[in-house]
């Protein structure tokens, strides 16, 4: 790898550094599908953006392999809790890879936010934040799931979101 | 953009890379003003530092435009709550920009932490963490607000803090 | 610092940039020792990795000085709460340095998760996330502690973890 090659690599690196992959996707009215699929996200409006990553049906799609800090927050809330709701909410980031048929758990939280809202008319709020570094190959996807998604509260994209950046 | 220009840019980039903007500000006795303004922070003592960002009246001030991962944690706690179980805490990161007269919500959490007190012992603790990537222009500011700030507990700068770094 | 020197530094920087220090360690059955020591972590299997950082007895060990975003999440849960347990859980990231005999608190959270279980037989879940930027010197170590660790729930490395990357 001679000087010219090194130079090219440096130029390349500078350019790629300028677009260090990053994204921040925000919650929207269409985020909760009720279909059992992952949450869907706004990618362009307001605070949302994609830089060096792409998006497909709820998933952040990796274009450049590497280590990424991925994160998600969901705003939970309700008036009482839905009848028959298991007292646990699971919020997770999951990887989809062409090399494996099922989603792989990456980062997961379980919470019991309804515990103190024992009456049907009691308003409560809670929040779940996840973040961590994972290795992602080009073409792999990351999605957010919440079970039970009925308890996710969406408003303006600031309370529930999903993002990543290469570290 | 010839070789010389590229070289200059690379040298420049190396130098700027050495000071990739980052900051971590910590809670202090003076953080809670009770004035309705944002929380104030320690910028120099202990774990607090500023590198390529500046500070003014509670705000992290951006000197170099770009995408930043911004974060804040607040330690919540109390003996009982002013509004009982109905007490809601809103913890948020907000942007101030010269181009717009009002603060813009960036990342927000709502919690109902007061249900964490058991029936006899009224003492409770909770914590709220926010983090996400946002684009910030030079001169723009980010602040932290907590409503009701009476429920924020400060001690030694490790439990409530505010920071950012360019990604 | 002539052109040759600059070139060497750039080459060096590119190489070090390729291995920007990062790590993500995951919870395992052996994490909870009950000995009063820090939590122990998986460093190789599954999602766990070390890149430019090393590991020793629960600690991430810094090999390259700089500012690091360090983070940890612990999954808490139980059936009721252990008899006599103070209703507070403390989850923290602590620094060990050769220059000082005691661990230094970096980032800490306190929570009262047991208030969410309204009866002694009620199952509850909660989660605690910490993240922030700290300066670490070569040879310094960061560990995670949870008091009372009886309430940490481990399963598959996705619910309790510990990581860092240079910013």
């Amino acid at each position: 790898d001679g000087p010219a090659g090194s130079w090219e690599q440096l130029i390349q690196e500078r350019r790629s550094h300028e677009v260090n992959p990053a994204a921040h996707l925000t919650g929207a009215n269409s985020s909760l599908t009720g279909s059992g699929g992952p949450l869907l996200w706004e990618t362009q409006l307001g605070l949302a953006f994609l830089r060096g990553l792409s998006y497909h049906d709820g998933a952040l799609v990796v274009t450049k392999a590497g280590y990424y800090y991925i994160y998600s927050k969901v705003q939970l809330g309700g008036v009482g809790c839905p009848l028959g709701l298991a007292s646990t909410i699971t919020h997770g980031l999951y990887k989809r890879t062409p090399r494996y048929p099922e989603e792989l758990e990456l980062l997961v939280s379980q919470q019991s936010p309804c515990g103190r809202a024992t009456s049907s008319s009691r308003v409560w709020w809670d929040s779940s934040f996840l973040g961590g570094v994972v290795h992602l190959e080009a073409g792999e996807e990351v999605v957010v799931r919440v079970l039970d998604e009925r308890l996710v509260r969406l408003r303006d994209g600031t309370r529930s979101y999903f993002g990543a950046f290469m570290v | 953009d010839g070789p010389a220009g590229s070289w200059e840019q690379l040298i420049q980039e190396r130098r700027s890379h050495e000071v990739n903007p980052a900051a971590h500000l910590t809670g202090a006795n003076s953080s809670l003003t009770g004035s309705g303004g944002p929380l104030l922070w320690e910028t120099q003592l202990g774990l607090a530092f500023l590198r390529g960002l500046s500070y003014h009246d509670g705000a992290l001030v951006v000197t170099k435009a770009g995408y930043y991962y911004i974060y804040s944690k607040v330690q919540l706690g109390g003996v009982g709550c002013p509004l009982g179980l109905a007490s809601t805490i809103t913890h948020g990161l907000y942007k101030r920009t010269p181009r717009y007269p009002e603060e813009l919500e960036l990342l927000v959490s709502q919690q109902s932490p007061c249900g964490r007190a058991t029936s006899s012992s009224r003492v409770w603790w909770d914590s709220s963490f926010l983090g996400g990537v946002v684009h910030l222009e030079a001169g723009e500011e980010v602040v932290v607000r907590v409503l009701d700030e009476r429920l924020v507990r400060l001690r030694d700068g490790t439990r409530s803090y505010f920071g950012a770094f360019m990604v | 610092d002539g052109p040759a020197g600059s070139w060497e530094q750039l080459i060096q920087e590119r190489r070090s940039h390729e291995v920007n220090p990062a790590a993500h360690l995951t919870g395992a059955n052996s994490s909870l020792t009950g000995s009063g020591g820090p939590l122990l972590w998986e460093t190789q299997l599954g999602l766990a990795f070390l890149r430019g950082l090393s590991y020793h007895d629960g600690a991430l060990v810094v090999t390259k000085a700089g500012y690091y975003y360090i983070y940890s999440k612990v999954q808490l849960g139980g059936v009721g709460c252990p008899l006599g347990l103070a209703s507070t859980i403390t989850h923290g990231l602590y620094k060990r340095t050769p220059r000082y005999p005691e661990e230094l608190e970096l980032l800490v959270s306190q929570q009262s998760p047991c208030g969410r279980a309204t009866s002694s037989s009620r199952v509850w879940w909660d989660s605690s996330f910490l993240g922030g930027v700290v300066h670490l010197e070569a040879g310094e170590e960061v560990v995670v502690r949870v008091l009372d660790e009886r309430l940490v729930r481990l399963r598959d490395g996705t619910r309790s973890y510990f990581g860092a990357f240079m910013v």
């Epitope: - | 706690g77 003996v79 009982g80 709550c81 002013p82 509004l83 009982g84 179980l85 109905a86 029936s119 006899s120 012992s121 009224r122 003492v123 009476r150 507990r153 001690r155 | -």
Partner: antibody, heavy 119, light 111 residues
Framework: QVQLVQSGAEVKKPGASVKVSCKAS????????MNWVRKAPGQGLEWIGR????????NYNQKFMGRVTFTVDRSTSTVYMELSSLRSEDTAVYYC????????????WGQGTLVTVSS | EIVMTQSPATLSVSPGERATLSCKAS??????????MNWYQQKPGQAPRLLIY???NLESGIPARFSGSGSGTEFTLTISSLQSEDFAVYYC?????????FGQGTKVEIK
């Protein structure tokens, strides 16, 4: 200015119930807890419980549980304390006390309502 | 419940003198560096009046001759120079745990 005005004195027979009112003015009613405290002749002060006007949530001293009920009428900024199954030892002056800004003290008090239980 | 014990039961003091009232709690009333202890004054036929909250904070409108100190289980109310209007019964009260409990009171009378 903050004012808490309580209803007038009551004389009740053992086994009866009494309902004392406390009307608040001069502040945002739902922003402050209301406590109830009594003072029996020759005794000290005794906390009965509290109500959160914003929600109607109540916390009672276990000693009075099952006999005391607090209610709130937000339209008139009034809280009520009803004590049932009265006995002679319930003879006391009953006070409402507003929770302070930091809510764990009582910064304004009503003038008191004397309840006498006698056969 | 937390038992509050005040001493002395009666304190005889001359006007202008210093009065020191003591209150002991059966367990700590501290939380995160704050003491959940309040002091009230009550005169015959009147409602109690808040003097000191959180062990040492002077309530608005209360004269500066009143001060509070202490932490954990032992607390003190001091009246630096007694005025004629200060002769009354003083109660300490804890608010860290339900039920809130008061001491039995200290009567400050003219010597």
């Amino acid at each position: 200015q903050v004012q808490l005005v309580q209803s007038g004195a009551e004389v009740k027979k053992p086994g009866a119930s009494v309902k004392v009112s406390c009307k608040a003015s001069g502040y945002t009613f739902i922003d402050h807890i209301m406590n109830w405290v009594r003072k029996a002749p020759g005794q000290g002060l005794e906390w009965i419980g509290r109500i959160y006007p914003v929600s109607g949530e109540t916390n009672y001293n276990q000693k009075f549980m099952g006999r005391v009920t607090f209610t709130v009428d937000r339209s008139t900024s009034t809280v009520y304390m009803e004590l049932s199954s009265l006995r002679s030892e319930d003879t006391a002056v009953y006070y409402c006390g507003r929770g302070s800004y930091y809510w764990n003290a009582m910064d304004y008090w009503g003038q008191g309502t004397l309840v006498t239980v006698s056969s | 419940e937390i038992v509050m014990t005040q001493s002395p039961a009666t304190l005889s003091v001359s006007p202008g003198e210093r009065a020191t009232l003591s209150c002991k709690a059966s367990q700590s009333v501290d939380f995160d560096g704050d003491s959940y202890m309040n002091w009230y004054q009550q005169k015959p036929g009147q409602a109690p009046r808040l003097l000191i909250y959180s062990a040492s904070n002077l309530e608005s409108g209360i004269p500066a001759r009143f001060s509070g100190s202490g932490s954990g289980t032992e607390f003190t109310l001091t009246i630096s120079s007694l005025q004629s209007e200060d002769f009354a019964v003083y109660y300490c009260q804890q608010s860290i745990e339900d039920p809130w409990t008061f001491g039995q009171g200290t009567k400050v009378e003219i010597k």
